[in-house]
């Protein structure tokens, strides 16, 4: 089956700047600003565009060693990024893949809203574990706040 979870979160960072940092250069930034959440990101194949496969490794003590993500779409003019978790982590006997969509929307106050959709593609009749959805959401929030803090502290970065 397919189980869809949608969330929204806000940031004080303007949409264009946040997209550059969080999406377009996140693979470089995450291990630097949130080493407690992500230890490394490496491209397995591709140059960053659609079809690219990347391996995200987690620090010691995490329940999973790594996940592999596939880049599905990067729309840098509309601040949209689609990717799928295709291997490692929770992917296995009951879960086929997780398709994720992130859209960053500018707000009138100069900040932004992140609209996030996570589609869990389960095998057969299996359901999604609530703790997995919660862990995924917490990871996203951790990375976002770490990037946000970095940008607030480094006013020249990603302008």
């Amino acid at each position: 089956g397919v189980f869809n979870y949608e969330t929204e979160t806000t940031s004080v960072i303007p949409a264009a700047r946040l997209f550059k940092a969080f999406i377009l250069d996140g693979d470089n930034l995450f291990p630097k600003v949130a080493p407690q959440a992500i230890s490394s990101v490496e491209n397995i194949e591709g140059n960053g565009g659609p079809g690219t496969i990347k391996k995200i490794s987690f620090p010691e003590g995490f329940p999973f060693k790594y996940v592999k993500d596939r880049v599905d779409e990067v729309d840098h003019t509309n601040f949209k990024y689609n990717y799928s978790v295709i291997e490692g982590g929770p992917i296995g006997d009951t879960l086929e893949k997780i398709s994720n969509e992130i859209k960053i929307v500018a707000t009138p106050d100069g900040g932004s809203i992140l609209k996030i959709s996570n589609k869990y593609h389960t095998k057969g009749d299996h359901e999604v574990k609530a703790e997995q959805v919660k862990a995924s959401k917490e990871m996203g929030e951790t990375l976002l706040r770490a990037v946000e803090s970095y940008l607030l502290a480094h006013s020249d970065a990603y302008n």
Partner: antibody, heavy 125, light 112 residues
Framework: EVELVVSGGGLVQPGGSLRLSCAAS????????MTWVRQAPGKGLEWVAN????????YYVDSVKGRFTISRDNAKNSLYLQMNSLRAEDMAVYYC??????????????????WGQGTTVTVSS | DIVMTQSPLSLPVIPGEPASISCRSS???????????LDWYLQKPGQSPQLLIY???NRASGVPDRFSGSGSGTDFTLKISRVEAEDVGIYYC?????????FGPGTKVDIK
Amino acid sequence: EVELVVSGGGLVQPGGSLRLSCAASRFILSHYWMTWVRQAPGKGLEWVANIKQDGREEYYVDSVKGRFTISRDNAKNSLYLQMNSLRAEDMAVYYCARGGFWGAMGYYYYGLDVWGQGTTVTVSS
Amino acid sequence: DIVMTQSPLSLPVIPGEPASISCRSSQSLLQSDGHNYLDWYLQKPGQSPQLLIYLGSNRASGVPDRFSGSGSGTDFTLKISRVEAEDVGIYYCMQTLQTGFTFGPGTKVDIK
């Protein structure tokens, strides 16, 4: 506000040399391709040269190949244009401009979205 | 090299009225990523050029929504829905599909 400040223009004799500088402020140069564009008196805009974010690739308009060199010092957040064997037809206002963004996901183009104020190069004997 | 042409080369306008500038390239600017590598720039008198539209139709940050870009392949248009006095200057299209960027000759817009 992000800004590019151009300097180094002046009067030079035919066959002489000049080095233009473009200092970036409020953004990190190493994330961007950079470009030089010029405008001869009373004429339109002409692209001169591009340099990749890491300085490993350079491109030039045919008329300046072998005479001009674009370079960058990311540590100093600065872009340069070394102009040798200057000719009368090189006389123009020279602008630097910021090109596409380069990050882990590759190269993404947002137009030449930041321009310097320009510096005048006069070639005359 | 890709050759860019613009028409008209001179455009007298009336404030509050719409205006349109055409740009044509000698080969298609549509890239495999679905984007048209065509920008529009405005150079106001005595100033540096400023970006209006990038990749054919995307308005740059801070550009008023009266400016819009359209077209695909080899034919492009810049439209100003209601001209304001501050819009006078020379408008250039530029291709960035090939690394040897090329500008159009420019369209001079002034108040009639």
